[in-house]
Interface confidence: low
């Protein structure tokens, strides 16, 4: 099966790489604009230069193109805890990230929030914190894992999943209570 091409891709495929077909005259192939620039005017004729202009501050193009406008620079979302790793330039968008000892949680493909890496108190680090994944903790005896924190088995209620992990401790507590009532 041949993938469906949009009109623009069809038109571009007629011209050699690095060129695009003139929108008003399909016998002319114009040279695409370099990254960091945008198309101001199409080339007037074969072998003549395309009029490309540099992107203004606050905008960019990251690859060769024939866009009529540069793309607006992304802004790091402070409300998501993001920090700017590198500023926007005419040929590269802003790069956003998280602070040290934080990881990214992606809400959607393009939106992430920064969270603090778990420290594994009362446990050990099974897998270190990664750029896009929290630390994976293993808890010490007498503690169970709840929402990636090691919680004392004294907080384990019988109805919870922790009963399997905390069974000896729970039985001991029960035994103590029983002996106190006799």
């Amino acid at each position: 099966l041949v993938p469906h091409l949009g009109d623009r891709e069809k038109r571009d495929s007629v011209c050699p790489q690095g060129k695009y077909i003139h929108p008003q005259n399909n016998s002319i192939c114009c040279t695409k604009c370099h990254k960091g620039t945008y198309l101001y005017n199409d080339c007037p004729g074969p072998g003549q230069d395309t009029d490309c202009r540099e992107c203004e501050s606050g905008s960019f193009t990251a690859s060769e193109n024939h866009l009529r406008h540069c793309l607006s620079c992304s802004k790091c979302r402070k409300e998501m805890g993001q920090v700017e790793i590198s500023s926007c330039t005419v040929d590269r968008d802003t790069v956003c990230g998280c602070r040290k000892n934080q990881y990214r949680h992606y809400w959607s493909e393009n939106l992430f929030q920064c969270f603090n890496c778990s420290l594994c108190l009362n446990g050990t680090v099974h897998l270190s914190c990664q750029e896009k994944q929290n630390t994976v903790c293993t808890c010490h005896a007498g503690f169970f894992l709840r929402e990636n924190e090691c919680v004392s088995c004294s907080n384990c209620k019988k109805s919870l999943e922790c009963t399997k992990l905390c069974l000896p401790q729970i039985e001991n507590v029960k035994g103590t209570e029983d002996s106190g009532t006799t």
Partner: nanobody, 124 residues
Framework: EVQLLESGGGLVQPGGSLRLSCAAS????????MAWVRQAPGKGLEWVSF????????YYADSVKGRFTISRDNSKNTLYLQMNSLRAEDTAVYYC?????????????????WGQGTLVTVSS
């Protein structure tokens, strides 16, 4: 037992304002991320806004950005949604929702508890 009780809904004219409240109980409120979700008549659920446990981080759906403000008072265990410049398309039942995890939500719909909802009708 976890309980979320919304209030503040009602009938308002286009361009008007309303403030929704959600009283929370049965869990350690300041620790959990919270959200507002809505359901317009005959439509599916639409996520509106979220706020982190510390109240510092917020996020809004594009449809309400600049008009709605989410906030919380952790000392009162209450979540708020200030709705300004209301439009007919904001007509919906608004639900307060608690995220299942306090570490990081798995998605925008990773809720374990919902309120019963409060109806907001925007009409002239």
């Amino acid at each position: 037992e976890v309980q979320l009780l919304e209030s503040g809904g009602g009938l308002v004219q286009p361009g008007g304002s309303l403030r929704l409240s959600c009283a929370a109980s049965g869990f350690t409120f300041p620790v959990y991320n919270m959200a507002w979700v809505r359901q317009a008549p005959g439509k599916g659920l639409e996520w509106v806004s979220f706020i982190a446990g510390n109240g510092q981080q917020t996020y809004y759906a594009d449809s309400v950005k600049g008009r709605f403000t989410i906030s919380r008072d952790n000392s009162k265990n209450t979540l708020y949604l200030q709705m300004n410049s209301l439009r007919a398309e904001d007509t919906a039942v608004y639900y307060c929702a608690k995220f299942a995890s306090k570490v990081s939500p798995m998605s925008l719909t990773d809720f374990d508890y919902w309120g019963q909802g409060t109806l907001v009708t925007v009409s002239s």
